[in-house]
């Protein structure tokens, strides 16, 4: 150290200056009353840490020091103290005893002063060695704190420069926003622009609807009048068939009136007048039992009584022998009309069969046999069948002589199997045969390789399962 | 007697392909369909594909799709079964084998000696 | 796929012993089970179909029994031309599968 000055400011606090290099660092110390005593707990050699202090920490120890440095200064002052005053006695005590003994007396004194000043001067080398050990340490405690000082700058500049890019792209996206938002606005005034045509075009259609339904309301009136008009040619012509069987006594004379309005087959409804498809209801031959049918009106020259239909899986085909003797399903739909009736109405007259079938490419093709009849329950229904002709394949897909009617409950096929079991439906089945238009219904890409599907060998082959099918007859004569 | 008779035995590159043809003698060829089974070595049986020789309908394995095709020649009563991009686990034991039904594919009452097909490079 | 998994792979008998294959499917295959047997180097050959109907020719120490899910293989009273590997095989459902096989060898 270059320098080092102790003085006084003028509010009464010690000032100790340290100069080292071209740095000049200057201490201001409060007063203290007490003086630290010589057992405090002060270690001058003691290690200090390698990290900076945490700013409290350093405050604490600052004060510390402030402390041991202002004791020491008390302490130094009052050896100062005690230096003059022995001087002073000693001084006096020479005037007192010049006379007596001054050489040795001198002597002694000097003697005295002497190892006194030594002793004080040891001290006092002391006292500064543990100043200067204490001002190294705050020197460098305060290096420690410029260092991270240092380094909370340059993480405050980071963090400015993260805020400024934050700050750009936040401008960025507010850009883009009210872009989106220019963006929104247009297509929002476009699509109000399509909400009005589209409403023009809604009120249109209302309007449309409108006279559509004024003209349903004339139609349908119409419709009343012409249905009252029929209704009194039936009702003349039902008084003209009993006048006719009262004037002639050979004939029966109890004719119903329902005899002459029911109908056996579809072709009896259309030689009615109803050219119409749709559900029909029938009379059983020589009963007056009735069931629910569909009607083809337009294939073919109309006239035909749909027997199965098969279009999209909607019911199941795995049924019992009573429900395939009575029927099951919905005529408008997916259906079996029913073997007792089918039989009942084909030994009455000679009747033709036409199977329609459907794949899921798209393609269609028919069987038709000219002569089609069941045999009775007695018979397992036993199906028989003359002359095919038609797309769906030049062999019979239906085996030749015809075979029983099997079920799942009604075994009578010719397999070591149940064909019904192992194929699911009821069918004329062979052992099993080359067909079952009541298997299993398939969707598309699932209709191949499907042993137990809906099957027409002669037309698809093996495994494969058909889109659609539809069993219809009609009289040979029609 | 009803007879199915393969063709040789092949040694076959992975990547290639592999024709196995099948004549058939003692009944009308068109009246049963025809498949195609392979049994690796040590190995158990695996089925691979059926043809209808009638009508040329085919089904195969869903592991084998796209890699298989069955054709038949109805003048010469031969089936073939062709496998392509071999790979060394193909390496097997191919029989052709009759149905016992034209329309399905039932249990096979009669079968091929087998075609021994080794796939190596 | 149908999943047919046979049991034991592999049974040690005598001329005469009585042997029985069994042979479990993953789902109801009704009855449409065949077995067969293979010989070394040989083809298979159909012994049983329908589950228990034996082809022609077939001995009748051979039966077959079982429906749904349980099939069995019955050899009443083995032959030396017995010995050979037997596979069961389901056809009820697409596609066709077989049996890992059972090996009957001789004690």
């Known amino acids: 150290y270059n320098n080092f000055r102790k003085s006084m400011d003028s509010i009464g606090k010690k000032q100790y200056q340290v100069q080292h290099g071209s740095c000049s660092y200057t201490f201001l110390l409060p007063e203290m009353d007490n003086c630290r005593s010589s057992s405090s707990p002060y270690v001058s050699n003691a290690v200090q840490r390698d990290a900076p202090l945490e700013y409290d920490d350093s405050v604490q120890r600052l004060q510390v020091l402030e402390n041991i440095m202002e004791n020491n200064t008390q302490w130094l002052m009052k050896l100062e103290n005690y230096i003059q005053d022995n001087m002073k006695k000693e001084m006096v005590e020479i005037q007192q005893n010049a006379v007596q003994n001054q050489t040795a007396v001198m002597i002694e004194i000097g003697t005295n002063l002497l190892n006194q000043t030594a002793e004080q001067t040891r001290k006092l080398t002391d006292v500064e060695a543990q100043v200067l050990n204490q001002t190294t340490r705050l020197e460098l405690q305060l290096l420690e704190h410029s260092l991270s000082t240092n380094k909370l700058e340059k993480q405050i500049l980071d963090q400015t420069s993260e805020i400024n890019k934050l700050q750009d792209k936040n401008s960025f996206l507010e850009k883009k926003v009210l872009a989106m938002e220019d963006k929104h606005i247009i297509q929002l005034q476009s699509i109000k622009e399509e909400k009005d045509q589209l409403q023009v075009l809604v009120s249109k259609q209302n309007s449309i609807i409108e006279e559509l339904e004024k003209k349903i309301v004339t139609a349908t009136v119409n419709n009343s009048v012409l249905q009252k008009q029929q209704h009194d040619l039936m009702e003349t012509v039902n008084n003209l068939l009993t006048m006719m069987s009262t004037s002639n006594s050979a004939k029966d004379p109890t004719v119903a009136k329902e005899e002459q309005i029911s109908f056996r087959d579809c072709a009896e409804v259309f030689k009615s007048g109803h050219t119409t498809n749709g559900i029909y209801t029938l009379t059983f031959p020589n009963s007056t039992e009735e069931i629910k049918a569909y009607c083809d009106m337009e294939a073919g020259g109309g006239g035909w009584t749909i027997i199965q239909r098969r279009e999209d899986g909607s019911v199941d085909f795995q049924r019992t022998w009573k429900e395939y003797k009575v029927g099951f399903g919905n005529p408008s739909g997916e259906y079996w009309l029913g073997n007792e009736f089918v039989s009942q109405l084909t030994n009455q007259q000679r009747y033709v069969l036409k199977i329609h079938l459907k794949d899921w490419e798209g393609n269609e093709a028919y069987s038709l046999y000219e002569h089609f009849y069941l045999s009775s329950e007695e018979l397992n229904y036993r199906i028989h069948l003359k002359g095919l002709t038609g797309t769906a394949g030049k062999i019979s897909s239906i085996s030749q002589p015809g075979n029983d009617f099997s079920t799942k409950d009604g075994d009578n096929d010719k397999c070591i199997c149940k064909c019904s079991q192992m194929l699911t439906g009821g069918w004329w089945f062979d052992a099993c045969g080359p067909s079952n238009l009541n298997g299993m219904y398939y969707p598309q890409r699932q209709n191949t390789n499907k042993f137990n599907g809906i099957k027409w060998y002669y037309w698809k082959g093996s495994g494969y399962s058909l889109k659609a099918t539809t069993m219809m007859i009609r009289p040979a004569d029609f | 007697q009803v007879q199915l008779v393969q063709s040789g035995a092949e040694v076959k590159k992975p990547g290639a392909s592999v024709k196995v043809s099948c004549k058939a003698s003692?009944?009308?060829?068109?009246?049963?369909?025809m498949v195609w089974v392979r049994q690796a070595p040590g190995q158990g049986l695996e089925w691979m594909g059926y043809?209808?020789?009638?009508?040329?309908?085919?089904g195969y394995n869903q592991k084998f799709e796209g890699r298989v095709t069955m054709t038949t020649d109805t003048s010469t009563s031969t089936a073939y079964m062709e496998l392509r991009s071999l790979r060394s686990d193909d390496t097997a034991v191919y029989y052709c084998?009759?149905?016992?039904?034209?329309?399905?594919?039932?249990?096979?009452?009669?079968w091929g000696q087998g075609t021994l097909v080794t796939v190596s490079s | 796929d149908i999943q047919m998994t046979q049991s034991p792979s592999s049974v040690s008998a005598s001329v005469g012993d009585r042997v029985t294959i069994t042979c479990k499917a993953s789902?109801?295959?009704?009855?449409?089970v065949a077995w067969y047997q293979q010989k070394p180097g040989k083809a298979p050959k159909l012994l049983i179909y329908?589950?228990?109907t034996r082809d022609t020719g077939v001995p009748s120490r051979f039966s077959g029994s079982g429906s749904g899910t349980d099939f069995t293989l019955t050899i009443s009273s083995l032959q030396p031309e017995d010995f050979a590997t037997y596979y069961c095989?389901?056809?009820?459902?697409?596609?066709?599968?077989f049996g890992g096989g059972t090996k009957v060898e001789i004690k």
């Open positions: 084998a009759r149905t016992r039904d034209r329309y399905d594919v039932w249990y096979f009452d009669v």
């Open positions: 003692g009944y009308s060829f068109t009246d049963y369909n």
């Open positions: 043809i209808d020789p009638y009508n040329g309908g085919t």
């Open positions: 789902q109801d295959v009704y009855i449409a």
């Open positions: 329908w589950a228990s």
């Open positions: 095989h389901q056809y009820s459902s697409y596609p066709p599968t």
